[in-house]
C-alpha cells in the first residue's frame, strides 16, 4: 500500500485549496488568535504500526471533513473551492480506508490507537467550541483555516516519516 505517497500529494492539493479559500485579510484577525492545543505528541511517536498511524491520519481528515461540511462553513467559504476541498478530503479518506484493510492482514497489532484518536477528536472539539464562542465570525473562521493548514503541514511531516520507515 503506497498510501504515504498518494496521501502526500492529496495533502498538498488540500493545502493549496485551503490557502485559496481565504476571504478576508488575516491581518485584521490577529487578536482572535487562539491556542487549540494541536496534539503534536500523537504525530511525534515512532511507536505506531502503519495501520495505527493511518487510523490517526484518517481521524484527522475525517474531523476536518466534518468541520468544513457544516452549514456555517458553507455560509463562509466560496462554494466551488469548498466542494473541491471536500472532494479531495473524501478521496483521501477512501484511500486510507482501503489501505488500512490491506495493512490489517500484515500486522497483528490493534487496528486503532484509541488514545491518539481521542486526542484528535478533543482537538477538533476545541476548534468547534472556539467557533461557537466566536459566533462563527469571519475572523474566527480565518483563524481556524490557518490552524487546519498548520495541522495539515505537521501531519505531512508525520506522513513523510512514515514513508521513510517503509
Amino acid at each position: 500500500c503506497d498510501l504515504p505517497q498518494t496521501h502526500s500529494l492529496g495533502n498538498r492539493r488540500a493545502l493549496i485549496l485551503l490557502a485559496q479559500m481565504g476571504r478576508i485579510s488575516p491581518f485584521s484577525c490577529l487578536k482572535d488568535r487562539h491556542d487549540f492545543g494541536f496534539p503534536q505528541e500523537e504525530f511525534d511517536g515512532n511507536q505506531f504500526q502503519k495501520a495505527q498511524a493511518i487510523s490517526v491520519l484518517h481521524e484527522m481528515i475525517q474531523q476536518t471533513f466534518n468541520l468544513f461540511s457544516t452549514k456555517d462553513s458553507s455560509a463562509t467559504w466560496e462554494q466551488s473551492l469548498l466542494e473541491k476541498f471536500s472532494t479531495e478530503l473524501n478521496q483521501q479518506l477512501n484511500d486510507m480506508e482501503a489501505c488500512v484493510i490491506q495493512e490489517v492482514g500484515v500486522e497483528e497489532t490493534p487496528l486503532m490507537n484509541v488514545d491518539s484518536i481521542l486526542a484528535v477528536k478533543k482537538y477538533f472539539q476545541r476548534i468547534t467550541l472556539y467557533l461557537t464562542e466566536k459566533k462563527y465570525s469571519p475572523c474566527a473562521w480565518e483563524v481556524v483555516r490557518a490552524e487546519i493548514m498548520r495541522s495539515f503541514s505537521l501531519s505531512k511531516i508525520f506522513q513523510e516519516r512514515l514513508r521513510r520507515k517503509e
Epitope: 490557502a19 485579510s25 488575516p26 490577529l30 487562539h34
Partner: antibody
Framework: EVQLVQSGAEVKKPGESLKISCKGS????????IGWVRQMPGKGLEWMGI????????AYSPSFQGQVTISADKSISTAYLQWSSLKASDTAMYYC??????????????WGQGTLVTVSS | DIQMTQSPSSLSASVGDRVTITCRAS??????LNWYQQKPGKAPKLLIY???SLQSGVPSRFSGSGSGTDFTLTISSLQPEDFATYYC?????????FGQGTKVEIK
C-alpha cells in the same frame, strides 16, 4: 535550520532607489509572514510593515505607508523592502523577521542579521 | 496605534540582582505581548511571547507576566551576558508597536 539571510550593506545617495532582500530557508516560507523593522543609529526598534508571502498581502505602519514598498517572491523564498527615492533620514539598520500569522506560535522568533543602509551625499 | 511605554528607560544593576522591567499598553492587548533582548550590533532576540511563554533556548531566569495593559519582564538573577537593551512589543493589532527600550547597564 531556520535562517533569514539579508542582503549586504548599502551606501546610496539621496534620491536614489534601493531594494534590499531577506531570504528564508529551513522552513515553509509561505507558512509565515515576514515583518520589517527599522533601527536608526543609537535608537530603538520601529515596526515598518509586514507581508504574507502566500498571497503578497501587505500591511504598513502609518509612519511608513507610501515611503517604502514591501514585496515577496515565494518561488525563491525571498521578501523585499524597497525605496523609490531615498532620503538621508532613511539611514538605519533594517531587519526582517518571521511571524507565524494567525497560528498560536512565537512571534518574530527568527530574525535576519540586518542590512545597514547609509544615505549620504 | 497602540502606544507602548516601558519603564525605566535605563537601569544599573549588579550580577545576581533581580531586575524588573515594566511595559504599559495604551489600550488592552490581551496577552499579545513579546519581550526581546538586543545587544550592540546584533539583531533582537525573542525572550518571551504571549506575555509569559518562554521562548525555546532562553534561560529560565527570564520570566514574563501580565495581561491587558500592564506587563512585566523579570530577570531573577542577572548574569554578565544579560547586560543589553530590552524591548516590549504588542502583536494584538496592526500596526505592531515597540516600547522605547530599557538599557540594563553594569553598576
Amino acid at each position: 535550520e531556520v535562517q533569514l539571510v539579508q542582503s549586504g550593506a548599502e551606501v546610496k545617495k539621496p534620491g536614489e532607489s534601493l531594494k534590499i532582500s531577506c531570504k528564508g530557508s529551513g522552513y515553509s516560507f509561505t507558512s509565515y509572514w515576514i515583518g520589517w523593522v527599522r533601527q536608526m543609529p543609537g535608537k530603538g526598534l520601529e515596526w515598518m510593515g509586514i507581508i504574507d508571502p502566500s498571497d503578497s498581502d501587505t500591511a504598513y505602519s502609518p509612519s511608513f505607508q507610501g515611503q517604502v514598498t514591501i514585496s515577496a517572491d515565494k518561488s525563491i523564498s525571498t521578501a523585499y523592502l524597497q525605496w523609490s527615492s531615498l532620503k538621508a533620514s532613511d539611514t538605519a539598520m533594517y531587519y526582517c523577521a518571521r511571524h507565524p500569522g494567525l497560528n498560536w506560535a512565537p512571534d518574530f522568533d527568527y530574525w535576519g542579521q540586518g542590512t545597514l543602509v547609509t544615505v549620504s551625499s | 496605534d497602540i502606544q507602548m511605554t516601558q519603564s525605566p528607560s535605563s537601569l544599573s544593576a549588579s550580577v545576581g540582582d533581580r531586575v524588573t522591567i515594566t511595559c504599559r499598553a495604551s489600550q488592552s492587548i490581551s496577552k499579545f505581548l513579546n519581550w526581546y533582548q538586543q545587544k550592540p550590533g546584533k539583531a533582537p532576540k525573542l525572550l518571551i511571547y504571549f506575555a509569559s511563554s518562554l521562548q525555546s533556548g532562553v534561560p529560565s531566569r527570564f520570566s514574563g507576566s501580565g495581561s491587558g495593559t500592564d506587563f512585566t519582564l523579570t530577570i531573577s538573577s542577572l548574569q554578565p551576558e544579560d547586560f543589553a537593551t530590552y524591548y516590549c512589543q504588542q502583536s494584538n493589532t496592526l500596526p505592531f508597536t515597540f516600547g522605547q527600550g530599557t538599557k540594563v547597564e553594569i553598576k
